[in-house]
C-alpha cells in the first residue's frame, strides 16, 4: 500500500512543497514520486519512506507517489492547489462627468486569480457593496447599473477582488482597483440666457450678461462669451444654482456690421449654447455748417445740416425737404438772432431700432451800438439830496462801452448810487462805443430844491 | 498536458482572405484567453489581438483592426484568426498562444505556428 | 508603441560559461498596479517561442534555475548561469503593460 503526505496542499504560485511517499511494505522494489515539477529528494534513513522538495510549482498539479512491493504495485496521489492573487483589477475606463438621471454602467474586469472558486469580485461606492459575484472566465467580468445621483457626486467606485482561503487555514487575499471618482452634474435643457444691446456703436462700449439657473455644480460650470472672434473676459458671479456673467464689450470700425454674440455654458461633457445677433454701427453726430459763425446784422446766412447717408434730418424741427440727410435754412442776419442756436437733429434706423443724434450751433450777430429812451431815458428829475441811481444802458455785440459826460469832463455815474446834488444838474452827452462804431445820446437831470416844495 | 494545436499551412493570392485555427486542449479552455502573434521573416515578433475565450470579447493591435478578425467557438474548443485584404508584407508564421487576457504573466504555451505565404 | 532594444543582436558563449542578455525598454513598464509585466521567451531553431521568465523574474514551470531574470522600470537583463548545448536559439523578451504589446528584437544565442 503507497500512502503521501499531505494528500492535499495549497501554495503560492512559484512556491515550494515537500512531499512523503511511504510504503506499507518493508523493503520496496521501488519507490518515488512522478511529476513533471523540478524535485530533489531528501536523504532518509530506511527504504519505505522518500521526502521530496517539489519546486516553482506554477499550477495545481497531481504529483503521484508509486511502489512496488512483493504484494503487487500501487499509487498515491497528492492534490497541489496553487493559489495567487489576481494580475489586474481594474474597472473600465468612464468619463468622469455622468449627468444625473442617466444609467451608468460599472464593468470591473478582473485578470488571472486561483482558485477560482475562492476568488470572489465586488464592486463598491465607498465601502457599500454594490454586486457581489464569483470571478468566472478570463478575464472575470462583473458589472452593475447606477443610476447617477445628485449625491453621488464626488462618490468613489471600485472594484475588490477577495480570494478567500481561511477555509484552508490561511488567510483573505484583497485586492483592490484604483477609484473611480464620479462627478455628477446637471446642465439644464433650457439655454442660458443673454441679455445685450441689440445695437452697438463703434467706438463705445456695451455690457453683455449671460445667466443661468439650475446648473449644479454651479462652480464647475464654464461661460464662454464671444462676440464674433474676440473672446469677452466676463466676471462671472454664482448663486446656489445659478451664474450670471457679465462683461464688457468693446467694438472698433472694424466689427461693423452683423456680428454673432454667443455665450456657451459647458458642464461635464455637455454644453448649452445661446446666439444672438448685434449690429454694429457708425453714426456720427449730424454736421451743422454756419457759412460764418459770426456776422454783422443785416448779413444773408446760409444754415446746412448734413448727416450719415441712410439719415433723416431735421433743422430747427422742419424735416429736410425731401426728406434725406441734408438739411438748409437762409436767413438775414438780426440783432435778435444774436446766440441763436441750430440744432440739426438726424434720425438712422439700425436693425430696426431708431438712433438719434443732434448736433447744434450758435449764431453771433454783431450790431449796435444802441442807445434809446427806454434803456437810457434822455430826462430826469431827482429831489435834492435824495438817493438815486442813474440808469444807461448800451446795446450791441459786442458790448459797447459807455460813458456819460457834462462839459466833456464831469462823468455821471452810471449805475451807482448817489446823493443828488446841485453840481449833478446839467446836460449831459452819452456816447456808447463799440467795434462796430458810436452812438451818443443827450441826458439832461434837473435837482429840484427843497424851498420849491 | 497543455496543447495548441493550429490548421496547416496556407499560400494565398494578394487581395484574399485567410482564416487560421487554433484547437486547446489539456486545460480548461475558457480559463484562458488566447493570444495571436505573428513572425514575418527577419522581423520582430509582433502581437496581433486577443479574444476572451469565456465572453468573446476581443482586443486588437490598432494595426490589424479592420483586417484582422478574432472569434471563438467554446464547443470546440477552438479560436480563429481571419485576416483579409492581404497583401505580400502579411507573409509570416502566425501562432496562437494561451496566456491571461492581458498577457500579464506571459504567453505561456503556444501553437506550433501556421506559415501563411502570400504571393501572386 | 513601446519598443524594446535587445543587446547583443548575437551572442556567442562557450559551453558551461555564463551568458546574458540586456533588454530596454523606451518606456517605463511599472505598471499603475506596481507590477512589471516584461517577460522573457526562448526560440529554438525550429520552434515556436517558449516562455522562461514572467514578470521580470519569476521562472515558468519546467525551466531550469540556470535561467533567471532581473532588471526594473526601462533595463531589464536575462542570465544563463552555465550554457548548455540545449540553450541555442533565439531569446526575446516581450512586454504586457502598454498596449500594444511588443517584443524585442531577438538575441541570437550560439556556441563558440
Known amino acids: 500500500q503507497t500512502s503521501v503526505s499531505p494528500s492535499k496542499v495549497i501554495l503560492p504560485r512559484g512556491g515550494s512543497v515537500l512531499v512523503t511517499c511511504s510504503t506499507s511494505c518493508d523493503q520496496p522494489k521501488l519507490l518515488g514520486i512522478e511529476t513533471p515539477l523540478p524535485k530533489k529528494e531528501l536523504l532518509l534513513p530506511g527504504n519505505n519512506r522518500k521526502v521530496y522538495e517539489l519546486s516553482n510549482v506554477q499550477e495545481d498539479s497531481q504529483p503521484m507517489c508509486y511502489s512496488n512491493c512483493p504484494d503487487g504495485q500501487s499509487t498515491a496521489k497528492t492534490f497541489l492547489t496553487v493559489y495567487w492573487t489576481p494580475e489586474r483589477v481594474e474597472l473600465a475606463p468612464l468619463p468622469s462627468w455622468q449627468p444625473v438621471g442617466k444609467n451608468l454602467t460599472l464593468r470591473c474586469q478582473v485578470e488571472g486569480g486561483a482558485p477560482r472558486a475562492n476568488l470572489t469580485v465586488v464592486l463598491l461606492r465607498g465601502e457599500k457593496e454594490l454586486k457581489r459575484e464569483p470571478a468566472v472566465g478570463e478575464p472575470a467580468e462583473v458589472t452593475t447599473t447606477v443610476l447617477v445621483r445628485r449625491d453621488h457626486h464626488g462618490a468613489n467606485f471600485s472594484c475588490r477582488t477577495e480570494l478567500d482561503l481561511r477555509p484552508q487555514g490561511l488567510e483573505l487575499f484583497e485586492n483592490t482597483s484604483a477609484p473611480y471618482q464620479l462627478q455628477t452634474f446637471v446642465l439644464p435643457a433650457t439655454p442660458p440666457q443673454l441679455v445685450s444691446p441689440r445695437v452697438l456703436e463703434v467706438d463705445t462700449q456695451g455690457t453683455v450678461v449671460c445667466s443661468l439657473d439650475g446648473l449644479f455644480p454651479v462652480s464647475e460650470a464654464q461661460v464662454h462669451l464671444a462676440l464674433g472672434d474676440q473672446r469677452l473676459n466676463p466676471t462671472v458671479t454664482y448663486g446656489n444654482d445659478s451664474f450670471s456673467a457679465k462683461a464688457s464689450v468693446s467694438v472698433t470700425a472694424e466689427d461693423e456690421g452683423t456680428q454673432r454674440l454667443t455665450c456657451a455654458v459647458i458642464l461635464g461633457n455637455q454644453s448649452q449654447e445661446t446666439l444672438q445677433t448685434v449690429t454694429i454701427y457708425s453714426f456720427p453726430a449730424p454736421n451743422v455748417i454756419l457759412t460764418k459763425p459770426e456776422v454783422s446784422e443785416g448779413t444773408e446766412v446760409t444754415v446746412k445740416c448734413e448727416a450719415h447717408p441712410r439719415a433723416k434730418v431735421t433743422l430747427n424741427g422742419v424735416p429736410a425737404q425731401p426728406l434725406g440727410p441734408r438739411a438748409q435754412l437762409l436767413l438775414k442776419a438780426t440783432p435778435e438772432d444774436n446766440g441763436r442756436s441750430f440744432s440739426c437733429s438726424a434720425t438712422l434706423e439700425v436693425a430696426g431700432q431708431l438712433i438719434h443724434k443732434n448736433q447744434t450751433r450758435e449764431l453771433r450777430v454783431l450790431y449796435g451800438p444802441r442807445l434809446d429812451e427806454r434803456d437810457c431815458p434822455g430826462n430826469w428829475t431827482w429831489p435834492e439830496n435824495s438817493q438815486q441811481t442813474p440808469m444807461c444802458q448800451a446795446w450791441g455785440n459786442p458790448l459797447p462801452e459807455l460813458k456819460c459826460l457834462k462839459d466833456g469832463t464831469f462823468p455821471l455815474p452810471i449805475g451807482e448810487s448817489v446823493t443828488v446834488t446841485r453840481d449833478l444838474e446839467g446836460t449831459y452827452l452819452c456816447r456808447a462805443r463799440s467795434t462796430q462804431g458810436e452812438v451818443t445820446r443827450k441826458v439832461t437831470v434837473n435837482v429840484l430844491s427843497p424851498r420849491y416844495e | 498536458q497543455v496543447q495548441l494545436v493550429q490548421s496547416g499551412a496556407e499560400v494565398k493570392k494578394p487581395g484574399a482572405s485567410v482564416k487560421i485555427s487554433c484547437k486547446g486542449s489539456g486545460y480548461t479552455f475558457t480559463d484562458y484567453a488566447l493570444h495571436w502573434v505573428r513572425q514575418a521573416p527577419g522581423q520582430r515578433l509582433e502581437w496581433m489581438g486577443v479574444i476572451s475565450t469565456y465572453s468573446g470579447n476581443t482586443d486588437y493591435n490598432q494595426k490589424f483592426r479592420g483586417r484582422a478578425t478574432i472569434t471563438v467557438d467554446t464547443s470546440a474548443s477552438t479560436a480563429y484568426m481571419e485576416l483579409s485584404s492581404l497583401r505580400s508584407e502579411d507573409t509570416a508564421v502566425y501562432y496562437c498562444a494561451r496566456s491571461l487576457y492581458f498577457g500579464s504573466s506571459g504567453f505561456d504555451y503556444w501553437g506550433q505556428g501556421t506559415a501563411l505565404t502570400v504571393s501572386s | 508603441d513601446v519598443v524594446l532594444t535587445q543587446s547583443p543582436l548575437s551572442l556567442p558563449v562557450t559551453l558551461g560559461q555564463p551568458a546574458s542578455i540586456s533588454c530596454r525598454s523606451s518606456?517605463?513598464?511599472?505598471?499603475?498596479?506596481?507590477?512589471?509585466?516584461l517577460h522573457w521567451y526562448q526560440q529554438r531553431p525550429g520552434q515556436s517561442p517558449r516562455l522562461l521568465i514572467y514578470?521580470?523574474?519569476n521562472r515558468f514551470s519546467g525551466v531550469p534555475d540556470r535561467f533567471s531574470g532581473s532588471g526594473s522600470g526601462t533595463d531589464f537583463t536575462l542570465k544563463i548561469s552555465r550554457v548548455e548545448a540545449e540553450d541555442v536559439g533565439v531569446y526575446f523578451c516581450s512586454q504586457n503593460t502598454h498596449f500594444p504589446y511588443t517584443f524585442g528584437g531577438g538575441t541570437k544565442l550560439e556556441i563558440k
Open positions: 514578470k521580470v523574474s
Open positions: 518606456q517605463t513598464l511599472v505598471y499603475r498596479n506596481g507590477n512589471t509585466y
